[in-house]
């Protein structure tokens, strides 16, 4: 739970954040997990700790391993683990899957590609961007802050994009590269006022106390890629995240494209261990886009367990 994978290339800078947060945090100590040896904080070392961050300047293949961070405060100490893998640089242009960050999707209206992990580094603009190892040139490509903007996106723009920047530490410069895939969504389509397919307006959903319950909010917004479309749940008019009940969480479902080609979204509301007080809440399925917002309200009712007589 408190472990995080991090990876980098040899001879590049790699900065890793402790996956455990203090509440509050006074100091963070880092150790090599295998030897329990403390990692120094002096910046003259190639590998050193700096608060929540562990810095490899530059990284070496031999640095691979598990690192322990302990977030200390007067009350409680919290332990996290960073699983670090440093790879040799590939001689060819191919970027292997294990070096790829999460894929992002874009469309004609929205084509930002963020440079992964860049927030951890002390870098200055501009970023260099490459697609399939070729430096990006031409007025369609604009490096802006920590992301790349592509104008008039076409399907041919799909591919692997690498950002390259320089991390500066006490006057010394270190190179960093990070790669992620970019996919292009079809933009042919139109947008409608949201249509909520489920739940029905003022639906009563039967649930069993003590059991888990799922409510699905499903809505369609038009055809093709939608510039702004969202489905979400509210409890008594409050966002789930603000309601502060950990038993009730929302989870994004799959983007759906029905046979008629409509672009639809699902949001599942999961209620763990249904309690009596959950029956008193108003559950609103909200669907919104540029045309407006539609709301369907659901209430829960107790399902009476059926008596089975022999």
């Amino acid at each position: 739970k408190f472990s995080k994978q991090s990876w980098g290339l040899e001879n590049e800078a790699l900065i890793v954040r402790c996956p455990r947060q203090g509440k509050p945090s006074y100091t963070v100590d880092w150790y090599y997990s295998q030897t329990n040896k403390s990692i120094p904080t002096q910046e003259r070392n190639r590998v050193f700790a700096s608060g929540q961050l562990l810095k490899f300047l530059p990284a070496a293949v031999a640095d691979s391993g598990i690192y322990t961070c302990i977030v200390r405060s007067p009350t409680f100490n919290r332990t996290g683990y960073a699983n670090v893998t440093i790879y040799k640089k590939q001689s060819d242009c191919n970027v292997p899957d294990y070096l790829m960050y999460s894929t992002v999707s874009g469309s004609e209206k929205n084509s930002k590609i963020y440079c992964p992990t860049i927030d951890l580094y002390n870098w200055t603009a501009p970023l260099e961007w490459f697609k399939n190892c070729q430096a990006l040139q031409g007025s369609r490509y604009r490096a802006h802050k920590s992301f790349l903007v592509i104008d008039n996106v076409m399907t041919e723009d799909a591919g692997d994009y690498t950002c390259k920047f320089i991390h500066n530490e006490n006057g010394a410069n270190y190179s960093v590269t990070a790669t992620r895939s970019f996919t292009v969504k079809d933009e042919q389509g139109f947008s409608l006022f949201p249509v909520i397919g489920a739940p029905a307006q003022n639906e009563i959903k039967e649930v069993e106390i003590g059991k888990n319950a799922n409510l699905t909010c499903s809505a369609c917004f038009g055809k093709g890629t939608q510039f702004l479309a969202a489905v979400l749940w509210q409890l008594n008019g409050t966002k789930i995240t603000d309601f502060g009940e950990p038993r009730i969480q929302q989870e994004e479902g799959q983007n759906q494209s029905f046979s008629n080609g409509l672009a639809c979204l699902d949001m599942v509301l999961r209620i763990a261990d249904v309690k009596e007080e959950d029956l008193l809440l108003q559950y609103d399925c909200l669907a919104l886009n540029l045309h407006g917002l539609r709301r369907h309200t659901v209430r829960l009712s107790r399902k009476n367990p059926i008596d089975h007589h022999s």
């Epitope: 509050p24 006074y26 007067p74 009350t75 919290r78």
Partner: antibody, heavy 118, light 112 residues
């Protein structure tokens, strides 16, 4: 917005046990330590102890150790403070208070008055 | 335990006055991380304390800029540059350097 709502005032006899609840909302309960602070009538503030709701780990002030038990129920985002072997000097307002990433005692409950009287 | 001593225990002032409250700790509140773990709270009758200042000199969210705090490792000062009607309350200093966390005995600011 963040809210800590405590249970109502209680009157107890010497030797009895009192249990106060503190229901949190507006933030992720397990992401904040919960502390308890005592304030006797006309007196100052005294730290009693704390819990990390994520792990259930607790820490107590020496003065209250052995008499105080702090617990947390993640499912209802509620923290509890139980004080046993009550005596008249335990008559006080008890506050629950939550921490943030930057500091302790960021949010406070409205307080619960406990009166110990025979 | 770290002792926190405030002075004065009470003071009378008028709206617009500059008010200074001092707090002394029995041990330096300077942590090895360079932060001084000194806090100030305001409490009004029948209400819960409210955080004013954290880590010596940082204003908590929503606190007016007329409140300020300064000090070294053991001697601290809370200043209200121009006292407002809503500032009449009791003020507590506290340390969060080490357990047990301790508070000063409070300074009551009353209307003259």
């Amino acid at each position: 917005q963040v809210q800590l709502v405590q249970s109502g005032a209680k009157v107890k006899k010497p030797g009895a046990t009192v249990k106060i609840s503190c229901k949190a909302s507006g933030y992720i309960f397990i992401d904040s330590e919960m502390h308890w602070v005592q304030q006797a009538p006309g007196k100052g503030l005294e730290w009693m102890g704390a819990i990390d709701p994520e792990t259930g780990d607790t820490v107590y002030a020496k003065k209250f150790k052995g008499r105080v038990t702090i617990t947390a129920d993640k499912s209802s985002s509620t923290a509890y403070m139980e004080l046993s072997s009550l005596r008249s000097e335990d008559t006080a307002v008890y506050y629950c208070t939550g921490s943030t990433t930057d500091y302790y005692f960021a949010y406070w409950g409205q307080g619960t008055l406990v009166t110990v009287s025979s | 335990d770290i002792q926190m001593t405030q002075s004065p225990s009470s003071l009378s002032a008028s709206v617009g006055d500059r008010v200074t409250i001092t707090c002394r700790s029995s041990k330096s509140l300077l942590h090895s991380n360079g932060i001084i773990y000194l806090y100030w709270y305001q409490q009004k009758p029948g209400k819960a304390p409210k955080l004013l200042i954290y880590q010596l000199s940082n204003l908590a969210s929503g606190v007016p800029s007329r409140f300020s705090s300064s000090g070294s490792g053991t001697d601290f000062t809370l200043t209200i540059s121009s006292l407002q009607p809503e500032d009449f309350a009791t003020y507590y200093c506290a340390q969060n350097l080490e357990l047990p966390f301790t508070f000063g005995q409070g300074t009551k600011v009353e209307i003259k």
